[in-house]
Interface confidence: medium
């Protein structure tokens, strides 16, 4: 029986050129997380595998950074980034849990918004 629940950052709006943190957390289950996939509609952004670590999709390598935790940071946002994002937790023995985040990217009102930063 699947008992887990996913908490996410929910619906977010951010400014063009800025950065966003997409964050999910799976709770209320003792299932082992084997892999987390981050997807935008039908496109794979990144994978975090428990054994192999992070893999960022080549088309997003320049502006996607892994973390914090199992989350994902998307930088240099464009209006085309607007849409649904999914964190897909593959677990054993429960199976798959999916969290949804809707991102709306708005035209910038202030040019210097959205500083880049390091995730150690």
């Amino acid at each position: 029986m699947m008992t887990g629940t996913i908490e996410t950052t929910g619906n977010i709006s951010a400014e063009k050129g800025g950065s966003i943190i997409l964050q999910c957390h799976l709770s209320s289950t003792t299932a082992q997380v084997t892999q987390v996939n981050w997807e935008q509609q039908d496109q794979l952004l990144a994978i975090c595998n428990a054994d192999l670590g992070w893999h960022i999709s080549p088309s997003f390598k320049d502006r996607v950074a892994p973390g914090p935790g199992l989350g994902l940071t998307l930088q240099s946002l464009t209006v085309n980034d607007t849409g649904e994002y999914f964190c897909i937790y593959h677990t054993y023995p429960d199976g798959t849990y999916t969290g949804r985040i809707f991102l709306e990217v708005l035209e910038s009102s202030v040019a210097e918004h959205g500083a880049r930063f390091q995730i150690p």
């Epitope: 908490e7 800025g18 918004h113």
Partner: nanobody, 111 residues
Framework: EVQLVESGGGLVQPGGSLRLSCAAS??????MGWFRQAPGKEREWVAS???????WYADSVKGRFTISADNSKNTAYLQMNSLKPEDTAVYYC???????WGQGTLVTVSS
């Protein structure tokens, strides 16, 4: 209009403690993060908290810093213990979209 106001910084000796606060207004946030920028360095992520209470920490502060949030006050806190000289920086808070930054609060760890 969204506003973030950080406070609580100051001069502290190595091994000491400080508690930073970040008061947010303008809307309710599902996520708050603390970042820091040391002189001549890039801004780096320190810790973050989801509204439901789940927390994440950079390896460099794990076990020493604790992030928390009071949802009723729309305020995030960063309790910093066992401070080291390398924690010296201006500390900022931000929301999940990092569109808005406060003025920051300076933390100096020195004997």
């Amino acid at each position: 209009e969204v506003q973030l106001v950080e406070s609580g910084g100051g001069l502290v000796q190595p091994g000491g403690s400080l508690r930073l606060s970040c008061a947010a207004s303008g809307r309710t946030f599902s996520f708050m993060g603390w970042f820091r920028q040391a002189p001549g360095k890039e801004r780096e992520w320190v810790a973050s908290v989801l509204r439901g209470g789940y927390t994440w920490y950079a390896d460099s502060v794990k076990g020493r810093f604790t992030i928390s949030a009071d949802n009723s006050k729309n305020t995030a806190y960063l309790q910093m213990n066992s401070l080291k000289p390398e924690d010296t920086a201006v500390y900022y808070c931000a929301t999940e979209s990092m569109d808005y930054w406060g003025q920051g609060t300076l933390v100096t760890v020195s004997s």
